[in-house]
């Protein structure tokens, strides 16, 4: 899973994989993110040794374990890798570090009159990766509101110097803030000339290409196909550059492919990984773990989720299968890349997508695997639906959950409104794991408009269903994606693999949860149900939740949440987190809205003017 | 991968009972739910029933008026379909079939159930 | 019960030709529709549902689209594999129904 937390004063003993200089502990921790092998890192500011040579020292490292054993000391900044950290995964760096002079290979030198022009000077120049900036006060002043733009072999500083009234700072080409633009075109049966700077096995001339956007030191590249005439030359990709930053020439070459880095592109950038899946070819490397599973997408899956896995096999042949899974083979290599990549197998192979930041826009989640009493802690992208719906008035703070159920709508409780009933005063956040992570500047959506079931009176048990139309549609990601709704006669009359979640209180008088919590939760039926409640009305539109002796249930705050259950392989929003007598106590199951029963009443709200449906529901 | 395996043809008399059998292999078979779906013979498709061997929740078509009881063994992941009182309009053949999502993604090989007498 | 009225109910057509047929529900199903194909002699083999698009295996010439009470199945250049006969069915309320089906021939 992600692990975002830094360690102050600690340092990582041992599974070194690389060395470099950054300018601080977040540069390091996006380097080790992208470092194919890096899982966690070590940082040495200035300020943690008098070892000069040490000094801004940054220490990817890689365990066998995920972990190494921290020795204390003093300023040194330690962490993990943000690998399967999704949003949190990108290479933009926007800092200017005061008084620190970034050495490089410097190739250009301007008069400048800020140190943000020289950074978009930079950011504009095809070969500038880092730069360094002499102020108006620096002590020489022939080199007074100089504006040096460097580069280097590894794209990152050769040696960091403290230096006073000197600013550096990095490109931001991966912002995708770049004036230069793009080259989109491929180029087939064309090879380019000049310097090779790195040589990796690719599957294709498109997974070529993103390797080459995210190289320090790429520019173009060259990648040999598969029916290439030299077999040990077969999907070789190799990465590009040269001193005027394109190919000084270019050789019509039969079963070659060209292209250039993306890195200069305007406003978007390729994602950092690889989701096609290629039939028919297997990747060679170490092997990390065999595990039989249910298809090709489920190898992938497990290759994400294994935060070492780079790559995977999922072979076919008979001995590898037993009933309907099968081998999936899961793989890594120093470089990232398959070490051999062979054709016309019976296997299926693909890449991990450890450093996806964004999914696909299916229209409803259907492949994922209260605070809640007796929960655990959610992890990214396991519950894409779950929004935290909350009530800026003085302060801010978590009221409800809800569920996103398409672009522009969440399904929620009818009582989370209950005397707040003013759209404005509503924020919603989605995507989000843990509360604490949300900041004045975290994103949120407004309300629109919120529709409450016509049938639903304050106090009362029945209808307690709402929809929530937000100002602006939402993006689909890989953490923020709707949940199938069921449809009206769901033939299931008890579901056997349902969860709750929510970041309510963990106990009866508790407090709110800061990560995402989940609780597996059978369902009870309704007749059941109304003999632990016989002062109520148990509806057919309602379904009840719980253990019999108690222990673990939905709680204040998970009001609104989604009771989900596995059906037929898909996730399905069965029901809304709505009442109950305290918090899992013995024989008292929790009560929920039951979606089925209102599907009507969605579709109706849902739908516009045109009766085409804006939610979203499986398709 | 997901099979599902139909008993043979039955030959049966008007108002006797007929239980076809459907055997599962290739995937958990408690997870997903069962159906059944019969066609006579040049006719369309009609939906009776289905089980959810995990819970033992059945749903049926009311157009059967209680004669049809759809069963699941777990311990041969097997499920049953039974129809009583049988009539000519009830020849057909018969299908098991089993959902991803809703729509039938497997569907056993049929089995012909003639009633005649 | 939800009525699902499919036309025309048989066809003939060529190699190459685009095919369209449509379904029609007696009141809303939303996009809660599967298509399915069957041949003599065999079960039916889903196509594409409203739950999960295309399935796995079937040939990109054939598309749905449709929300509501309307939809269609079209097979944009037919080939010798597809004549057969055509179901859509509804999965929005129990009864699950069917569509009486379409049968394409040859011409």
């Known amino acids: 899973g992600c692990l975002t937390q830094l360690y102050e004063n600690a340092f990582f003993r041992g599974g070194d994989v690389a060395s470099m200089y950054t300018p601080n502990a977040q540069y390091c921790q996006m380097r080790c993110t992208f470092h194919p092998r890096c899982l966690l890192f070590s940082f040495l500011p200035a300020s943690s040794i008098n070892d000069m040579e040490k000094r801004f020292g940054c220490f990817l490292k890689d365990s066998v374990t995920g972990t190494l054993p921290k020795v204390h000391r003093t300023g040194a900044v330690s962490g993990h890798s943000l690998k399967q950290c999704g949003h949190q995964i990108s290479a933009c760096h926007r800092d200017i570090y005061k008084g620190v002079d970034m050495r490089g290979v410097n190739f250009n030198v301007s008069k400048v009159s800020s140190v943000e022009e020289c950074q978009k000077r930079c950011t504009s120049n095809i070969r500038c990766q880092f730069f360094s900036y002499a102020t108006q006060t620096f002590h020489k002043a022939e080199y007074r509101n100089n504006c040096l733009l460097k580069y280097s072999p590894g794209g990152t500083p050769t040696a960091i110097k403290v230096l006073s009234n000197v600013e550096s700072g990095f490109s931001l080409k991966p912002c995708a803030l770049s004036e230069i633009g793009c080259h989109m075109n491929i180029f087939q049966h064309l090879a380019f000339s000049d310097v090779d700077v790195a040589r990796v096995l690719t599957p294709d001339a498109f997974v070529c290409r993103t390797i080459c956007t995210y190289h320090p030191n790429c520019l173009f590249f060259t990648f040999y196909t598969n029916v290439w005439k030299i077999e040990s030359q077969r999907n070789v990709c190799l990465l590009k550059t040269s001193e005027s930053g394109t190919p000084s020439s270019s050789t019509p070459q039969e079963n070659t492919i060209s292209g250039y880095s993306l890195l200069t592109c305007k406003r978007t950038l390729p994602e950092p990984c690889h989701s096609k899946i290629y039939p028919g070819v297997d990747f060679g490397g170490e092997e990390l773990n065999v595990t039989f599973v249910k298809g090709v997408n489920v190898c992938q899956e497990t290759c994400t989720k294994m935060i070492r896995c780079q790559f995977f096999t999922y072979s076919l042949l008979p001995e590898d299968c037993k009933e309907e899974k099968c081998k999936c083979f899961l793989r890594l290599s120093m470089d990232g890349s398959p070490t051999r990549i062979a054709y016309g197998t019976q296997g299926s192979s693909g890449y991990s997508l450890r450093l996806c930041n964004t999914g696909d826009n299916s229209v409803c989640t259907t492949k994922t695997s209260t605070r809640i009493v007796g929960g655990t802690n959610s992890s990214w992208g396991e519950w894409p639906w779950q929004v935290s719906l909350q009530v800026k008035l003085t302060a801010q703070r978590h009221l409800c959950g809800g569920s996103l159920i398409g672009h522009q709508w969440v399904l929620t409780a009818a009582h989370c409104f209950d005397g707040l009933p003013l759209q404005d005063v509503w924020r919603i956040y989605s995507g989000i794991l843990n509360l604490s992570d949300i900041t004045k500047d975290t994103p949120f959506s407004q309300i629109k408009e919120i529709i409450i079931h016509q049938n639903y009176k304050v106090s009362e048990g029945n209808h307690d269903i709402a929809l929530i139309k937000l100002q602006a549609p939402l993006n689909y990601t890989e953490f923020q994606k709707p949940i199938c709704l069921p449809s009206k006669g769901d033939t299931s009359t008890i579901y056997t693999n349902c969860w709750v979640t929510g970041w309510g209180f963990s106990k009866e008088k508790g407090e709110i949860q800061n990560i995402l919590q989940k609780v597996n939760i059978p369902l009870v039926t309704n007749e059941e149900c109304q003999k632990r409640y016989q002062d109520y009305k148990i509806t057919q539109r309602m379904v009840c939740a719980g253990y019999k002796e108690g222990g673990k249930d939905a709680c204040k705050g998970d009001s609104g949440g989604p009771l989900v259950c596995k059906h037929n392989g898909m996730w399905r929003l069965v029901g809304i987190t709505s009442w109950g007598e305290g918090c899992a106590r013995r024989e008292q199951p929790g009560v929920y809205t039951k979606v089925a029963e209102y599907m009507d009443w969605i579709l109706e709200k849902t739908q516009s003017s045109d009766g085409k449906a804006q939610m979203q529901s499986p398709a | 991968q997901v099979q599902l395996v139909q008993s043979g043809a039955e030959v049966k008399k008007p108002g006797a009972s007929v239980k076809v059998s459907c055997k599962a292999s290739?995937?958990?078979?408690?997870?997903?739910?069962m159906h059944w779906v019969r066609q006579p013979p040049g006719k369309g498709l009609e939906w009776i029933g289905a089980i959810h061997p995990g819970s033992g929740g059945t749903a049926y078509n009311q157009k059967f008026k209680g004669r049809v009881t759809i069963t699941a063994d777990e311990s041969t992941s097997t499920a049953y379909m039974e129809l009583s009182s049988l009539t000519s309009e009830d020849t057909a053949v018969y299908y098991c079939?089993?959902?991803?999502?809703?729509?039938?993604?497997?569907w056993g090989q049929g089995t012909l159930v003639t009633v005649s007498s | 019960d939800i009525q699902m009225t499919q036309s025309p109910s048989s066809l003939s057509a060529s190699v190459g030709d685009r095919v369209t047929i449509t379904c029609k529900a007696s009141e809303d199903i939303y996009n809660r529709l599967a298509w399915y194909q069957q041949k003599p002699g065999q079960a039916p083999r889903l196509l594409m549902s409203?739950?999960?698009g295309l399935e796995a295996g079937v040939p990109s010439r054939f598309s749905g689209s449709g929300s509501g009470t309307d939809f269609t199945l079209t097979i944009s250049s037919l080939q010798p594999e597809d004549f057969a006969t055509y179901y859509c069915q509804q999965y929005w309320s129990t009864p699950w129904t069917f569509g009486q089906g379409t049968k394409v021939e040859i011409k």
């Open positions: 290739g995937y958990t078979f408690t997870d997903y739910e």
């Open positions: 079939a089993r959902p991803y999502g809703y729509p039938f993604a497997y």
């Open positions: 409203g739950e999960t």
